[in-house]
């Protein structure tokens, strides 16, 4: 996250930190995600497309720090990794950039709700906040485009939803932006998501409930003028989410 502020997981208790195990045994941070039911985390397909082996991934819930433990955190294996079959990224844009991870602890359990672990509500079909609404993004992504390392502490910031008409202007992203995407940015272009924030939540208040409105997907640079963050529009993927999680009880739809 460029700009914004450091936070703790209590403020974003649905945030999932996804890591990849390498052959040599090292573990690196991959992407963020959001807990949408006790057994399911939602993220972005582009995070996994190059290494789609579920056994390679570890998911932490209740974690405030990148490389050290947080009291009450839970560690999970990925029982099922579902990537969108129509994902594509021929150009700058990522299409259908959504993924589901079914999580299971070593003991065979899903997430146990606590002060630091909670699910986030999904929107209803095609129901999004008005453009201009302030929403939160969270992640362990870079604090500057040029940084080599990710920050150790979880960060969050506030961005405003931008209309499709504005985002499709030629000096923004033109027709790269589709109706299955949402754009959001800081009016001063000072704060934004960046590399490492992918897959994480764009959360907005909708009818008084904190709702997962978007998934961090793509953008040109980070916090560049006229180059907003682009997010997978969750309200347009509810049938896909339902069809892949339907055997699971307790999904907050």
């Amino acid at each position: 996250i460029i700009g914004g502020e450091f936070t703790t997981i209590e403020n974003q208790p649905w945030f999932a930190a996804i890591y990849r195990r390498h052959r040599g045994g090292s573990v690196t941070y991959v992407c963020g995600g959001s807990l949408i039911s006790p057994c399911w985390v939602i993220s972005a397909t582009h995070c996994f497309i190059d290494y789609p082996k579920k056994e390679d991934y570890i998911v932490y819930l209740g974690r405030s720090r990148l490389n050290s433990n947080t009291q009450g955190e839970m560690k999970f294996e990925v029982e099922n990794l579902i990537l969108h079959k129509d994902y594509s990224a021929d150009t700058l844009a990522h299409h259908n950039d959504i993924a589901l991870l079914k999580i299971r602890s070593k003991e065979g359990r899903c997430a146990q709700p606590s002060r630091t672990i909670q699910t986030i509500c999904l929107p209803s079909m095609y129901n999004d906040p008005q453009f201009g609404t302030s929403c939160e993004i969270t992640g362990f992504g870079k604090e500057n485009s040029t940084d080599y390392l990710y920050p150790e502490q979880l960060k969050m910031t506030v961005v405003k939803l931008i209309s499709h008409r504005e985002c499709q202007q030629p000096h923004y992203y033109g027709s790269e932006v589709t109706t299955k995407m949402l754009c959001a940015a800081d009016p001063q272009w000072k704060t934004d998501s960046c590399q490492g924030d992918s897959g994480g939540p764009l959360v907005c208040s909708l009818q008084g409930r904190m709702t997962l409105t978007g998934i961090v997907s793509w953008g040109r640079g980070c916090a560049l003028k006229d180059k907003p963050g682009v997010y997978t529009r969750v309200s347009h993927f509810l049938p896909w989410i339902r069809s892949h999680t339907k055997e699971e009880n307790g999904l907050a739809l």
Epitope: S88, L92, R220
Partner: antibody, heavy 115, light 112 residues
């Protein structure tokens, strides 16, 4: 094996029209965007335009030729087209079609605009 | 529109020696996922261009490992570790982060 076979080039007078075709084989044509690039004699490469796959709206993007050139596709025949209207002498070039934004290139077809 | 500037424009090389071509962009070519939307092509005499490197540093299938791409943001380099006679031609960089896509002017590699 991916193949892009181009046709439709030739000599044409200024102000007239020409349609280039790019017939694809060896891959699922409908899944891919298609691009056109041109190269004036003895010069460098110039990007002409691009058409997305139908799954992503089949929308087009153009360079400076916008308004005179139109890119279209017929997925049932695996053909991409470049319709060139109001041709000018400076449009004289070898035109290449490309699978996606960058991958496989056709053999090129020469368009000469001269009176 | 994004301007790509290649240097040198002409590059005479002895076979077996390394070669390096630079491509500078007027704007960043990096997206926020860390990918650099810059490709390198070789156009051999009388042939269509062929893709060598995509997304800044990924070799296209079938491209010999003596070719490598590096760089990030606005500065990119194509390196040939040991030039062979078959490497002669014109090398182009191309950005595809923003429409209209644009090419560098080309670098002509010739054998000394």
């Amino acid at each position: 094996e991916v193949q892009l076979v181009q046709s439709g080039g030739g000599l044409v007078k200024p102000g007239r029209s020409l349609r280039l075709s790019c017939t694809a084989s060896g891959f699922t044509f409908g899944d891919y965007a298609m691009s056109w690039v041109r190269q004036a004699p003895g010069k460098g490469l110039e990007w002409v335009g691009f058409i997305r796959s139908k799954a992503y709206g089949g929308t087009t993007e153009y360079a400076a030729v916008k308004g005179r050139f139109t890119i279209s596709r017929d997925d049932s025949k695996s053909i991409a087209y470049l319709q060139m209207n109001s041709l000018k002498t400076e449009d004289t070039a070898v035109y290449y079609c490309i699978r996606g934004a960058n991958w496989n290139w056709g053999q090129g077809t020469l368009v000469t605009v001269s009176s | 529109e994004i301007v790509l500037t290649q240097s040198p424009l002409s590059l005479p090389v002895t076979p077996g020696e390394p070669a390096s071509i630079s491509c500078r962009s007027s704007q960043t070519l990096m997206n926020r996922n860390g990918n650099n939307f810059l490709d390198w092509y070789l156009q051999k005499p009388g042939q269509s261009p062929q893709l060598l490197i995509y997304l800044g540093s990924n070799r296209a299938p079938g491209v010999p490992d003596r070719f490598s791409g590096s760089g990030s943001g606005t500065d990119f380099t194509l390196k040939i570790s040991r030039v062979e006679a078959e490497d002669v031609g014109v090398y182009y960089c191309m950005q595809r982060i923003e429409f209209p896509y644009t090419f560098g002017q080309g670098t002509k590699l010739e054998i000394k």
